[in-house]
Interface confidence: medium
């Protein structure tokens, strides 16, 4: 089954709800647009990242509420005999593909770690996502595409597991993502990425960036 | 609605100079990179010149052919771009258009980009 | 770094046609097309390999496998007779680079 249908519903972070706001805003603009699930979460990321505590404040009120309603529901709900056993993870079943992101730090920490021996992992991860966002979209492109390439046969992968539906159907069919050319490095200077400046214009209905948001 | 504007073409001779300007609307100008790209008579299309935005520093960047002669540059506050083109040769004989390309339309990417009419720039003596 | 288009194509009206573009950054890097009408205005029919921008008709559509990208039309129609370009990235710091650019008849 898919859990029990009486269990609180789980509850919403800040965030949660400045993405459900966003969401709605696009589908009253653009009602008959299809949404790139990826390109609308990168925006929505960055824009939060440029709100102010104070625009972000309605979303924290709207989430300290709704943690308000989930701990009261919880108070009230018994979940029903046998459900508190963590459901089992196929271990057969296809692995989840990286992000472009994942594929970029997997390249760099060796790289990183090399050069600053003493860092912590908290501050190699924090060094690494601002080489992230330093690179220009161009320069992100071979991680995007090799990511979308792997998320493509995740996609099969796991929609051949489900058709079998044993937990050990994986096994035969589900052969490691063959690991494609790897990109050689141009070394380059890492410029920042045109779209990370991005200054809303509220009167304007599009929200327009740099040439590197692609 | 979105417009780019290309004037200042004509007809100069051999080593002479000429500036183009691209006039843009309907965008927040500002935070887009622009771009001139030329066609030759019954030719294809060549990227010319690219500039980035005031976070960017202004960055340039020219195709070879025209590296040493042409200069792009912006005004964030009237919304225009230029091409400052000397030294001018007969193969630059060609028609200049303007364009802000790979644009994003609210939250969505659109995958919309915008193109000017084109502006002609003869070269002959 | 080049693209390579063919210089031209034809089409029997409604049928299907396919130009091809190949580059050896093409694995890495997206390709754009272009439609370039007989008077000279300059359409992205896709971006991203296979995206279609809003407001283009889904008879165009784009795929990219290895060092070619593929742009395809079908049910071709009239006003599709134009010139088609490609274009990529190739890294920040130059230019994106255009194929040749394929000139596409439509016959019938």
């Known amino acids: 089954g898919k859990g029990d249908p009486k269990k609180p519903r789980g509850k919403m972070s800040s965030y949660a709800f400045f993405v459900q706001t966003c969401r709605e805003e696009h589908k009253k603009k653009h009602p008959d647009a299809s949404v790139n699930f990826s390109e609308f979460s990168k925006k929505c990321s960055e824009r939060w990242k440029t709100m102010s505590a104070k625009e972000k404040g309605k979303f924290e009120d709207m989430a300290k509420a709704d943690k308000a309603r989930y701990e009261r529901e919880m108070k009230t709900y018994i979940p029903p005999k046998g459900e508190t056993k963590k459901k089992f993870k196929d271990p057969n079943a296809p692995k989840r593909p990286p992000s472009a992101f994942f594929l970029f730090c997997s390249e760099y920490r060796p790289k990183i770690k090399g050069e600053h021996p003493g860092l912590s992992i908290g501050d190699v991860a924090k060094k690494l996502g601002e080489m992230w966002n330093n690179t220009a979209a161009d320069d992100k492109q071979p991680y995007e595409k090799k990511a979308a390439k792997l998320k493509e046969k995740y996609e099969k992968d796991i929609a051949a597991y489900r058709a079998k539906g044993k937990p050990d159907a994986a096994k035969k069919g589900v052969v490691k993502a063959e690991k494609s050319k790897k990109k050689k490095e141009e070394e380059e200077d890492e410029e920042d990425e045109e779209d990370e400046e991005e200054e809303e214009d509220e009167e304007d209905e599009e929200e327009e960036e740099d040439d590197d948001d692609e | 609605a979105v417009q780019l504007v290309e004037s200042g073409g004509g007809l100069v001779q051999p080593k002479e100079s000429l500036k183009i300007s691209c006039a843009a609307s309907?965008?927040?100008?500002?935070?887009?990179?622009m771009y001139w790209v030329r066609q030759a008579p019954g030719k294809g299309l060549e990227w010319v010149a690219r500039i980035r935005t005031k976070p960017n520093n202004y960055a340039t960047y020219y195709a070879d052919s025209v590296k040493g002669r042409f200069t792009i540059s912006r005004d964030d506050s009237k919304s225009m771009v230029y091409l400052q083109m000397d030294n001018l040769k007969t193969e630059d004989t060609a028609m200049y258009y303007c364009t802000a390309p790979r644009r994003t339309e609210g939250i969505v990417s659109s995958g919309v980009d915008y193109w000017g009419q084109g502006v002609m720039v003869t070269v002959s003596s | 770094y080049e693209l390579i288009q063919p210089p031209s194509a034809s089409v029997t009206l409604g049928n299907t046609v396919s130009i091809t573009c190949s580059g050896d950054?093409?694995?890495?890097?997206?390709a754009y097309w272009y439609q370039q009408k007989p008077d000279k205005s300059i359409v992205r029919v896709i971006y991203k390999d296979s995206e279609r921008p809003s407001g283009i008709s889904d008879r165009f559509s784009g795929s990219s496998s290895g060092t070619t990208a593929t742009l395809t039309i079908r049910g071709t129609q009239a006003e599709d007779e134009a010139d088609y370009y490609c274009h990529s990235t190739y890294s920040d710091d130059k230019l994106p680079v255009f194929g040749g650019g394929t000139k596409l008849t439509v016959l019938g």
């Open positions: 309907g965008f927040t100008f500002s935070n887009a990179a």
């Open positions: 950054e093409l694995p890495k890097r997206y």
